[in-house]
């Protein structure tokens, strides 16, 4: 299980109003479209400048769009997706899942060097402390001779 | 790096045909829609067609039934076939990328912001 990757999923229902160029995003999958394996979801691919959802700040590149107006987005094509978010009117209604990356382990001592999440100064402190008794030993030693 | 390369274009007499070429590097090219915009001089830029991820083509009015938007994932390239050319297709010729699909318009629309364009190729009709 070393470098492994966890997510923090969270699921929001987010409310947009379409503005003057619509809801301001873009999304990729769907069934003959996989934008994650083994996965035929609808994704925010971009958020427009501008656009309805970036003044509302709540989507992100990268969630996964559950439903429209309560409307499943299990096993559509790309294009009935579309079609889908074109039609749902002035008031959208978006179930999203936002995926937050989390580090597995204490931060600021997982990498790729310290792959089993122990602390290098716990590896560190012991290690210098047998070299210094290692060498005290030593010198005493010689001085015996 | 990300890099849309145009080709193709050139001197051609009316009712002449070109074909042109777009090839992307730099991206994921499957997910993203590919259009064809043109500026002539003094004028301002304007798409003539586009084709989205999953291969649905645009056209404006003006070249509907004269040109053919085509895309070969494999290549990583769209191509713009040109047939019946007029004196007023004249112009340099764009390509430009936008990552998925607007949910709000098709990839014509003036809304539409390209994430990715290229440096051109010109078209003369004469």
């Known amino acids: 299980m070393n470098g492994r990757v966890d997510y923090l999923v969270t699921e929001e229902e987010i409310n947009l109003t379409r503005g003057p160029s619509g809801l301001g995003f873009n999304i990729v999958g769907g069934t003959d479209q996989q934008y994650v394996s083994n996965d035929s979801g609808i994704y925010v691919s971009r958020i427009k400048e501008n656009g309805a959802a970036a003044l509302d700040g709540r989507l992100q590149e990268g969630d996964k769009i559950l439903s429209v107006n309560g409307q499943d987005l299990k096993n559509l094509l790309h294009q009935d997706a579309v079609d889908l978010f074109r039609n749902a009117g002035y008031a959208v209604s978006l179930r999203v899942q936002h995926r937050l990356q989390v580090q597995n382990g204490p931060i600021g001592h997982r990498g790729e060097g310290d792959p089993s999440g122990i602390p290098i100064f716990m590896v560190l402190v012991p290690v210098f402390a047998l070299t210094m008794v290692a060498a005290w030993a030593f010198m005493r030693y010689r001085q015996q001779l | 790096q990300v890099q849309l390369v145009e080709s193709g274009g050139g001197l051609v007499q009316p009712g002449g045909s070109l074909r042109l070429s777009c090839v992307s590097s730099?991206?994921?090219?499957?997910?993203?829609?590919i259009g064809w915009f043109r500026q002539a001089p003094g004028k301002e830029r304007e798409g003539v067609s586009c084709i989205s991820s999953v291969g649905r083509a645009y056209y404006i009015d003006s070249v509907k039934g004269r040109f053919t938007i085509s895309r070969d994932n494999a290549k990583n390239t769209v191509y713009l076939q040109m047939n019946s050319l007029k004196p007023e297709d004249t112009a340099v010729y764009y390509c430009?990328?936008?990552?998925?699909?607007?949910?709000?318009?098709?990839?014509?629309?003036?809304?539409?912001?390209?994430?990715?364009w290229g440096q051109g190729t010109q078209v003369t009709v004469s």
């Open positions: 430009a990328a936008d990552f998925g699909s607007s949910v709000d318009s098709t990839c014509l629309s003036k809304e539409q912001r390209f994430d990715y």
């Open positions: 730099g991206f994921i090219f499957d997910y993203y829609a």
